[in-house]
């Protein structure tokens, strides 16, 4: 008895394509070693037509492939475009030659069948609606019309021009004719399911003078779309149901034993497996959608379905879609960190890591919002201003070629929990998905900047300091000053006459940044933080006001900022996520499953781009050492 | 959820031949693997033959006991699967049952328990 197992006999029609699935023992050799498929010759040679290590037959070529799913412990053999030569004994097995474990294999390809010469074949899929159209002469125009399905020798009738119909197609089918046409009929079957697949026959008159038309209706489940992804990275289901249900609820769902489970639909219904990691997208007013699922788990792998109905649930007889996701566990995108936590007040340092062969793409941050379908708006981007009511608190760090950028979120408030994406215009598969957990402060933040109504008067030197514990002794100190596009890490050498030095007092654990003279310009927020190498660590935030020196002028109090760094008012807060930034990028990532539209907001973000070069301190007077 | 009614079985001589017949009815089986199983008294029961379709193009998957004496198909206007067994052997005698579950997976395994029809005995006797 072969370890190997699979369909023993396989049959399918010209023009189709069959997927063979073959089941080998869970060992890792069998794993690992080369899987193929062969044809069986009469003189008892098999030869190889495909196999994983790459070899593809001539007759093969552009319509077969092969397919190792090691976790699963099978491999699939997807063929296409069949034909009747393709009629034959196969083998699917394992081994470095034909003669290992295999399983042999019938396929039959037969030609599409044929009936009767006056038969009209409809082809239709599950939950489409199909129009028969039946001609009689005028004799009959006056007759009773009617249409029935052949169940072997009877015939048993749909509907009929009396107004019956078969319980089984109530509300399904309707008999009707046009304008004023005397010598045709239709009948329209709406819902389709798989049972109304067979011969009908339409029928004019009674008797011998009854006019006769066959109908051979075929109704074809959706054959599922083969989806082969990384563990960890995305896949979108592109669903497009028809104008017909264009005004439907419209829902995804995961096969399950004879259910299929939602996981989101336009009603707000989403399954909690997939929180943070799923958008729901209406792409025009043609009932067309797609689902973006990031993050992708082992558990992901399965039949997925789309459709649409009023109850946003899966019902019988209404078009669906379907797709079967493969998730291999072997992939190239990188095991990340998927819960973050922060405290209060604190700051936390995200690594995004993505294509490291796509080092020049966008980079960008977005927060995942549950509302309705999901949506993610934007953040921050390499190239996309800083969200309003993120200012001063929001930075991404691009590290060319290390494959990975650091998003620093500080000022953390209870508000900031949730989920995060990192994503790129480049390559779609490596969006990961972050959970930000932040906590109530139990205890004084690590990094704290003296003074902390930090006033600088235009022409005076102006020092502040940022106080570490020792814990951060070894790693690099830094100070920069935070713009729209990041944070611009201050120059480590003298800046002549105006005398800009960071110094750090080992004793005291203290880094500070002086500016000297200060100028209009140094307004703004600062941040001082540690890192070692291009991995970034805590950071602190603190807004620096400047006045100008004349008695009595009004200056801006910047305690309100600092204010916000520490308490973050719900009401601000709140106030600030609804105001409309007019200059912000449009950068919304409920485009994001068609991957122009993202490749557009980045045209735009660069339109919208403040100036100021990213890394660069140029213009600025403050220093570091 | 699918309910199955099997019919066919019966006493039949060593050589003999029968038809069992499997029909569904609740919801319809075309996204099914439809599987015939088979228990002898004190035994676990055990795969003998399954069903699969995908538009037209149908998957038969046998035991190895089974190939070049059982046949499966599949009438779908009827909703109903056949097993058509030939060469009968004493060995063959058992309940054989029908079951159905999603086209996921080894069609010989993980047949959940409410998917199951009551089952029809054959007996075959020397």
């Known amino acids: 008895q072969s370890p190997i197992f699979g369909p023993q006999d396989v049959s399918s029609i010209e023009g189709n394509s069959v997927s063979i699935t073959c089941y080998y023992p869970d060992t890792s050799v069998n794993r690992h070693t080369r899987k193929y498929w062969c044809r069986q010759g009469a003189n008892g040679y098999c030869a190889t037509l495909i196999s994983s290590n790459g070899y593809l037959s001539k007759e093969y070529s552009g319509r077969a492939s092969l397919i190792n799913f090691p976790e699963n412990s099978t491999f699939v053999i997807n063929i296409a475009h069949l034909t009747q030569e393709d009629t034959g004994s196969y083998k699917c097995g394992l081994g470095t030659t034909n003669r290992g474990l295999f399983f042999d294999v019938s396929l039959e390809v037969s030609q599409v069948p044929e009936f009767p010469n006056d038969t009209h074949v409809y082809t239709k899929d599950i939950g489409r609606t199909v129009t028969i159209e039946c001609r009689f002469k005028e004799g009959n125009a006056h007759s009773k019309k009617s249409l029935c399905k052949k169940r072997g020798e009877a015939c048993e009738v749909v509907i009929d021009s009396t107004e019956y119909v078969d319980p089984s197609y109530k509300d399904r089918a309707i008999l009707f004719m046009k304008g004023t046409s005397r010598d045709i009929f239709y009948v329209n079957i709406s819902h389709l399911i798989p049972s109304d697949a067979g011969l009908y026959v339409c029928q004019a008159g009674e008797g011998p003078s009854a006019d006769k038309n066959n109908a051979d209706l075929q109704v074809l489940e959706p054959e599922p779309e083969l989806l082969y992804k990384d563990l960890r990275s995305s896949v979108t289901f592109e669903c497009d149901l028809g104008r017909e249900v264009a005004n439907d609820a419209k829902y995804l769902c995961r096969k399950n034993k004879e259910t299929c489970d939602v996981i989101i639909n336009t009603l707000g219904k989403r399954d909690p497996a997939f929180e943070g990691r799923i958008l729901l997208t209406p792409r025009d007013d043609n009932g067309r959608f797609s689902v973006l699922i990031t993050g992708l788990r082992k558990e992901d792998a399965g039949h997925y379905q789309c459709g649409a109905h009023s109850s946003g649930l899966p019902q019988e007889g209404w078009p669906v879609q379907a797709w079967q996701l493969f998730v291999n566990e072997e992939s190239t995108i990188p095991n990340s960190r998927s819960v973050v936590k922060g405290v209060t007040g604190g700051s936390v340092a995200i690594v995004c890591p993505y294509n490291p062969k796509e080092s020049s793409s966008l980079k960008y941050w977005c927060h995942w919002e549950a509302d309705e379908n999901g949506r993610c708006p934007v953040l921050v981007g390499t190239q996309a201003l800083v969200q309003e009511g993120y200012e001063g608190r929001l930075a991404l760090f691009d590290q060319p070629g290390s494959g990975a950028y650091t998003v620093i979120l500080n000022q953390l408030t209870t508000q900031d929990s949730g989920f995060y994406w990192c994503l790129t215009d480049g390559d779609s598969r490596w969006r990961t998905t972050i959970e930000l957990q932040v906590a109530e402060a139990t205890k004084k933040p690590d990094l704290e900047v003296t003074p902390q109504n930090a006033t600088a008067v235009i022409g005076e030197t102006f020092t502040i300091s940022c106080h570490y514990p020792c814990k951060f002794y070894s790693q690099e100190k830094y100070w920069c000053k935070w713009s729209n596009d990041g944070c611009h890490i201050l120059p480590s050498h003298d800046e002549g006459a105006r005398q800009s030095s960071v110094s750090c007092d080992q004793s005291s654990q203290i880094v500070s940044m002086t500016l000297n003279p200060v100028k209009k310009e140094d307004e703004g927020w600062y941040w001082c933080g540690v890192k070692e190498g291009q991995v970034y660590g805590e950071t602190t935030a603190i807004y620096v006001a400047v006045e100008e020196r004349t008695r009595g002028s009004p200056h801006i109090n910047p305690t309100d900022a600092n204010a916000r760094a520490k308490d973050a008012p719900e009401e601000e807060a709140m106030e600030s996520s609804v105001r409309e930034d007019e200059n912000k990028a449009n950068l919304d990532p409920r485009l994001f499953a068609d991957e122009r539209e993202i490749q557009n907001a980045g045209d735009q973000a660069q339109e919208n781009r403040a100036s100021g070069n990213a890394g660069s301190a140029g213009g600025q007077s403050g220093s570091s050492k | 959820q699918v309910q199955l009614v099997e019919s066919g079985g019966g006493w039949v001589q060593t050589g003999g031949s029968l038809r069992l017949s499997c029909a569904a009815s609740?919801?319809?089986?075309?996204?099914?693997?439809m599987g015939w199983f088979r228990q002898t008294p004190g035994k676990e029961r055990e795969f003998v033959a399954a069903?699969?379709?995908?538009?037209?193009?149908?998957?038969?998957y046998y035991t190895d006991s089974a190939k070049g004496r059982f046949t499966i198909s599949r009438d779908n206007a009827k909703n109903t699967v056949y097993l058509q067994m030939n060469s009968l052997k004493p060995e063959d005698t058992a309940v054989y049952y029908c079951?159905?579950?999603?086209?996921?997976?080894?069609?010989?395994?993980?047949?959940?328990?409410?998917?199951w029809g009551q089952g029809t005995q054959v007996t075959v006797s020397s």
């Open positions: 079951a159905a579950r999603p086209r996921v997976g080894d069609p010989r395994s993980r047949y959940d328990d409410d998917n």
């Open positions: 609740g919801r319809t089986v075309s996204s099914y693997y």
């Open positions: 069903i699969s379709w995908v538009g037209s193009s149908t998957y038969k």
